[in-house]
Amino acid sequence: CEEPPTFEAMELIGKPKPYYEIGERVDYKCKKGYFYIPPLATHTICDRNHTWLPVSDDACYRETCPYIRDPLNGQAVPANGTYEFGYQMHFICNEGYYLIGEEILYCELKGSVAIWSGKPPICEKVLCTPPPKIKNGKHTFSEVEVFEYLDAVTYSCDPAPGPDPFSLIGESTIYCGDNSVWSRAAPECKVVKCRFPVVENGKQISGFGKKFYYKATVMFECDKGFYLDGSDTIVCDSNSTWDPPVPKCLKVLPPSSTKPPALSHSVSTSSTTKSPASSASGPRPTYKPPVSNYPGYPKPEEGILDSLD
C-alpha cells in the first residue's frame, strides 16, 4: 500500500512511510481541536488488494467553546446550533435595547482549547436625550431628562402675540426610536396665513372664512359658461401660499359649424403634462369644449386645446 489516507480531523501516529506491507496497520489520533469518542476505530490495515481498509474521522469531535448565557434583554444564538470551534455565536437584543460590543463572536482554537474571539456583548436600554425645543412652542414632559424607547412627546404652539395664531407645522407627536434617535424632526410653530382666494367668474363653495390659516381648505366652482383651469380644491400650505395655486375660470368658446362629438357641460383640464397629440394631424376643432365634472369622460388632449386660439 502507498501512504495511508489523510483526514481533516485525524492525524497519523508516527511518520508515514513511502509504502506498507500487506497486513500492516497504521493508527491515527484526533488532531488538535478534536477529541476521540468511541466506538469507531481510528486505525486501518493494508489490504490484500493493496488498498487501505475503510476508516473515517467521524470519531473525532470538535472541541467546544465555553457556554454563553443569553445577555440580559437579548439572545445568544449559536450558528448551526453548535458551540464547536469554527462556528459563530450571534447576539440579538430585544426590542428597545441595543448592542454594546461585538454582534458576532467566533469560536476559535487556541492551542488545543476552543475559545471565543472576544467578550460577549451586552444589551443596553435604548435611551433618548430630550427632544429639541422649538421656537414659539413647547412639548410635553419638558422636565424629563432621559427618555426610554417608545416614550412619546407632543408639541403644541404658544399663544400668538398678534391677531393671528401660531400653526403647528409637521407631526405634533414624536417618539424615542430604536437607535436612540427621535422618530422624526420636531415640528415648527409659525404664523401661516394665506391671502383671500379670489376666482373671477367663479365662486367658493366650501371653506368659507375671513382668514385662511395653515391647512385651511377651500373649494370652488365656475359660473355657467366657464370652465375650471386648475384644481377645484386648494389648501393653505406652510409657506402661506395656496397649494395647488388658486384656479381660474375660463370662458367656454362658442361652437363652430364643424361640430365635434357632443360632450357634457365641462371637462377640467390639467396643466401637468404635454401630450404628443399636440402635433396630431387632421381636422381640428375651432372651439374649446364645455367643461364637465362627470366621471368617466376623458379629459381633452391638453396639447390640442392649448394650440387652439
Partner: antibody, heavy 120, light 109 residues
C-alpha cells in the same frame, strides 16, 4: 493498554502541602490532555483541574483555585497535582484521568485513585 | 451545589428499562458524558452523547437528549448495573470548567 497510577496520598495536617503524582503508560502521554477529579467520602465526583497536552492551558475549579497547581512532565510521562493550604474538606480519593484528545475532550481512562486525608 | 442536577436514587426491576436523567442549562449546547461507579472502584466511562459507547460497554446502555435534559437509558437492567451513575459536562459559567452531576444511585430490584 492505557494505565494510570496515582501516588502521593496520605494523612496530612490542615494548612500543610502534598504533591500527588500520576504515572501514565500505554499511550503517547505528550499528546493528550489530563484531568484531576476527587471524591469526598460518601459524596459525589468533583472535577478539579485540567492541563493541555503541552501544559500551556490549565483550568481549575473554584474550590481549589489558588491553592492547587496542576503540572506535567512529558519526558517522565507524569502528571502532578501540588496541593497547598490543605483543609479538612479536601479529604477525598483523588484520581487522574486521561482526556481523549490534545484538549479537554472526555475523561476516557481513570487511575485507581489515591486517598488524601486532611486531619489534625 | 452542582450545575447538573440528577435524581439521588432510582430503582428498577430486573429486566426492566430505567432512565437516569441529568438537567442543566449547558446541556442545551453540549453533549454529556456518563460514568458508572461501583463501590470502592474508579468511575468508568460508559456513554457520550446519544449512543457513543466505548468497547466493552453493553448495548443495553443508550443515551438521549432533549432541551436541557440528557438521559442515560438502561434497557433490560441487570444486577451488575447496580451502581452510582454520574453525568459530566461543561458548566454554564462561561469558562472552561467541567462539572459532574450529583450522581444517581441505581438499585436493581
Amino acid at each position: 493498554q492505557v494505565q494510570l497510577v496515582e501516588s502521593g496520598g496520605g494523612v496530612v495536617q490542615p494548612g500543610r502541602s502534598l504533591r500527588l503524582s500520576c504515572a501514565a503508560s500505554g499511550f503517547t502521554f505528550s499528546t493528550y490532555g489530563m484531568h484531576w477529579v476527587r471524591q469526598a467520602p460518601g459524596k459525589g465526583l468533583e472535577w478539579l483541574s485540567f492541563i493541555s497536552y503541552d501544559g500551556d492551558e490549565k483550568y481549575y475549579a473554584d474550590s481549589v483555585k489558588g491553592r492547587f497547581t496542576i503540572s506535567r512532565d512529558n519526558s517522565k510521562n507524569t502528571l502532578y497535582l501540588q496541593m497547598n493550604s490543605l483543609r479538612a474538606e479536601d479529604t477525598a480519593v483523588y484520581w487522574c484521568a486521561k482526556a481523549s484528545g490534545y484538549g479537554m475532550g472526555i475523561l476516557d481512562y481513570w487511575g485507581q485513585g489515591t486517598l488524601v486525608t486532611v486531619s489534625s | 451545589s452542582s450545575e447538573l442536577t440528577q435524581d439521588p436514587a432510582v430503582s428498577v426491576a430486573l429486566g426492566q428499562t430505567v432512565r437516569i436523567t441529568c438537567q442543566g442549562d449547558s446541556l442545551r449546547s453540549y453533549y454529556v458524558s456518563w460514568f458508572q461507579q461501583k463501590p470502592g472502584q474508579a468511575p468508568v466511562f460508559v456513554m457520550y452523547g446519544q449512543n457513543n459507547r466505548p468497547s466493552g460497554i453493553s448495548e443495553r446502555f443508550s443515551g438521549s437528549s432533549s432541551g436541557n435534559t440528557a438521559s442515560l437509558i438502561i434497557t433490560g437492567a441487570q444486577a451488575e448495573d447496580e451502581a452510582d451513575y454520574y453525568c459530566h459536562s461543561r458548566d454554564s459559567s462561561g469558562t472552561h470548567l467541567r462539572v459532574f452531576g450529583g450522581g444517581t444511585k441505581l438499585t436493581v430490584l
